[in-house]
C-alpha cells in the first residue's frame, strides 16, 4: 500500500533544489505547469544550495525534517474533535509551519528567517547555514524572482499532486 | 519559543550520520552516553553514506522527511479521543513508522527494507539508493555491530533529549 504523504510534490521540489539536481527540478516543475520565470527563480535558489556545498543540503534537510515532524505539523493546535483532526491534520496539505518557513525564506529579513529556523533547530551550525542560504537568495533574486517563486509555491500548494 | 519536536536527538544523529560529519556524530553520541562499540557501529553506517556520496544523503533525507510527515506519523490510527491524541501523537516520541524503518534497515533483508521505503517514496532512484545503503550496511556490520546499533537506538529513544 502506498501511504498518503503531506504534499509530496512540495518535498520533491525541495529536495531537487537542495540536491542541486537541475534535471529532477525541471521535471518536478513541469508537473505543476511552471512558467519560464518561475523556473528561473527556483534555479537561482538551487544555485545557492550548490554554491554552499553539501553541508547546506544536509543541514537544510535536517531543518525541513524537523519542522515537518514537529508538534506544529503534527496537529496544529490540537483540534477539538477527532473529526476535525481527520479533516485538518491528516490530509495531504502542506503544514502551515513549513509554509511559513518558506515564505520567510523568500520575503522575510535574514534575522526573521533565522529566528523561525531557531524555533525548530537551534544548533549554531544549522542557524549559520540558514543565514548563509538566506543571504545568498537575497543577493541573487530580484523582487520579481521572489514574486515568481511565491506564485510557483501557490501552484504547488494548490496542485492535485499536493 | 522553542517548539517541541519529535525526538530531536534522533534526527541530530541521523543527519550527522547521513552528512558524514564524524565530529557532530561523536558529539550527539556523547549526549546519549554511547559506548565505544555503539560508536563503532554508527560509524560503520556513516561510512556507507560517505562511500555512496552526496546522492545517498539527499535521497535518504527525502525518505526520512516523507515518512516523518506521512499520515502514519501524523496520527497513527486516528486515536479515538483528543486526549489520546495529545498523549500518543503530539508528544516528543519518535514516530513508530520511523522506528520500523530503522529496525528494518538494521535487522531486515534488503527486500524487506526497500519494500518499507517504497510505501512512502516509490521513486526508482530512491529505492535503488535504499538498496545500495542496505547492502553496504549488511556487508560492513557484524551481528554484534547491529546489536550495538539497536542498543544505541534504545538509548536514543529513551533519552530525555528525545
Amino acid at each position: 500500500v502506498k501511504m498518503a504523504e503531506t504534499c509530496p510534490i512540495f518535498y520533491d521540489v525541495f529536495f531537487a533544489v537542495a540536491n542541486g539536481n537541475e534535471l529532477l527540478l525541471d521535471l518536478s516543475l513541469t508537473k505543476v505547469n511552471a512558467t519560464e520565470p518561475e523556473r528561473t527563480a527556483m534555479k537561482k535558489i538551487q544555485d545557492c544550495y550548490v554554491e554552499n556545498g553539501l553541508i547546506s543540503r544536509v543541514l537544510d534537510g535536517l531543518v525541513m525534517t524537523t519542522i515537518s515532524s514537529s508538534k506544529d505539523c503534527m496537529g496544529e493546535a490540537v483540534q477539538n474533535t477527532v473529526e476535525d483532526l481527520k479533516l485538518n491534520t491528516l490530509g495531504r496539505e502542506i503544514c502551515p509551519a513549513v509554509k511559513r518557513g518558506v515564505d520567510l525564506f523568500l520575503t522575510g529579513t535574514p534575522d526573521e528567517y533565522v529566528e523561525q529556523v531557531a524555533q525548530y533547530k537551534a544548533l549554531p551550525v544549522v542557524l549559520e547555514n540558514a543565514r548563509i542560504l538566506k543571504n545568498c537568495v537575497d543577493a541573487k533574486m530580484t523582487e520579481e524572482d521572489k514574486e515568481n517563486a511565491l506564485s510557483l509555491l501557490d501552484k504547488i500548494y494548490t496542485s492535485p499532486l499536493c | 519559543v522553542k517548539m517541541a519536536e519529535t525526538c530531536p536527538i534522533f534526527y541530530d544523529v541521523f543527519f550527522a550520520v547521513a552528512n558524514g560529519n564524524e565530529l557532530l556524530l561523536d558529539l550527539s553520541l556523547t549526549k546519549v552516553n554511547a559506548t565505544e562499540p555503539e560508536r563503532t557501529a554508527m560509524k560503520k553506517i556513516q561510512d556507507c553514506y560517505v562511500e555512496n556520496g552526496l546522492i545517498s544523503r539527499v535521497l535518504d533525507g527525502l525518505v526520512m522527511t516523507t515518512i516523518s510527515s506521512s499520515k502514519d506519523c501524523m496520527g497513527e490510527a486516528v486515536q479515538n479521543t483528543v486526549e489520546d491524541l495529545k498523549l500518543n501523537t503530539l508528544g516528543r516520541e519518535i514516530c513508530p513508522a520511523v522506528k520500523r524503518g530503522v529496525d528494518l534497515f538494521l535487522t531486515g533483508t534488503p527486500d524487506e527494507y526497500v519494500e518499507q521505503v517504497a510505501q512512502y517514496k516509490a521513486l526508482p532512484v530512491v529505492l535503488e539508493n535504499a538498496r545500495i545503503l542496505k547492502n553496504c550496511v549488511d556487508a560492513k556490520m557484524t551481528e554484534e555491530d547491529k546489536e550495538n546499533a539497536l542498543s544505541l537506538l534504545d538509548k536514543i529513544y529513551t533519552s530525555p533529549l528525545c
Epitope: 542541486g20 539536481n21 537541475e22 534535471l23 529532477l24 527540478l25 525541471d26 521535471l27 516543475l29 513541469t30 508537473k31 511552471a34 519560464e36 534555479k43 550548490v50 492535485p160 499532486l161 | 516509490a122 521513486l123 526508482p124 532512484v125
Partner: antibody, heavy 118, light 107 residues
Framework: EVELLESGGGLVQPGGSLRLSCAAS????????MSWVRQAPGKGLEWVSS????????HFADSVKGRFTFSRDNSKNTLYLQLSSLRAEDTAVYYC???????????WGQGTLVTVSS | DIQMTQSPSSLSASVGDRVTITCQAN??????LNWYQQRPGKAPNLLIY???NLETGVPSRFSGSGSGTDFTFTISSLQPEDIATYYC?????????FGPGTKVDIK
Amino acid sequence: EVELLESGGGLVQPGGSLRLSCAASGFTFSSYAMSWVRQAPGKGLEWVSSISGRVGSTHFADSVKGRFTFSRDNSKNTLYLQLSSLRAEDTAVYYCARSRGAAYFDYWGQGTLVTVSS
Amino acid sequence: DIQMTQSPSSLSASVGDRVTITCQANQDISNFLNWYQQRPGKAPNLLIYAASNLETGVPSRFSGSGSGTDFTFTISSLQPEDIATYYCQHYDNFPFTFGPGTKVDIK
C-alpha cells in the same frame, strides 16, 4: 528553426567505444534539457539518458548506467554521448532530442546508426 | 520501473475512420504521458503532451485523454499521411519508458 544533427555513429566491435555528437541550432541551447533516445532495428523507442540545461545533471537508463556518459558544451551548442563497453544489444539508431521541461521530446534529430558487431 | 503497454499492437482502418489506441501504465502516473508519431524511416514527432494537450502545429484530428493508469489516443478521421507507428511515453520519473508502439495502416 530548431535543428539537431547527430554524428559519430558507425561499426564497432563488442567491448569497444564510440562518441556520438549532436549539434543544435535555432534555440537557446542552455535553456533546455536534452536527451538521447535509441531504436534497435525493427524495434520500439528506448530512452537512454537526459541532461539538464545549465549544470549538466544527468540520468541514465539502467541498461546503460556505468557504460555511457552524457555531457554538453553550451558554448558550442553541442551534446556528447560517450558509449563504452559496447554490447550487441546497443546496436540501434541513436536520436538526440530536445526535452522541453525535461519531460517532452519536442524536437528530434534524424538519428545516427551504431552497429556493434564482431 | 514503470511499464507501459499499448493496444492494439497494430490496426488497419479506412480513410475517414475514427481510430483509438490505448496505453496503460502499471502504476499511477497522473497525467504525465506523451504521444508520438513515427512515420516509416523518420524520427518521431511529438503530438500530445501531458495526456491531453495538443502540441503546436499538430492537426486537431489528434487528441488524447486519460489519467492515472489508463490513457487513450484518438485520430478522429484517419488520413493517408497518418500511416505510422504511435508510441506513448511516461515522464512520472526517471527512467522514462515508452510503450511498445501501435502500427497504423490503411485498409
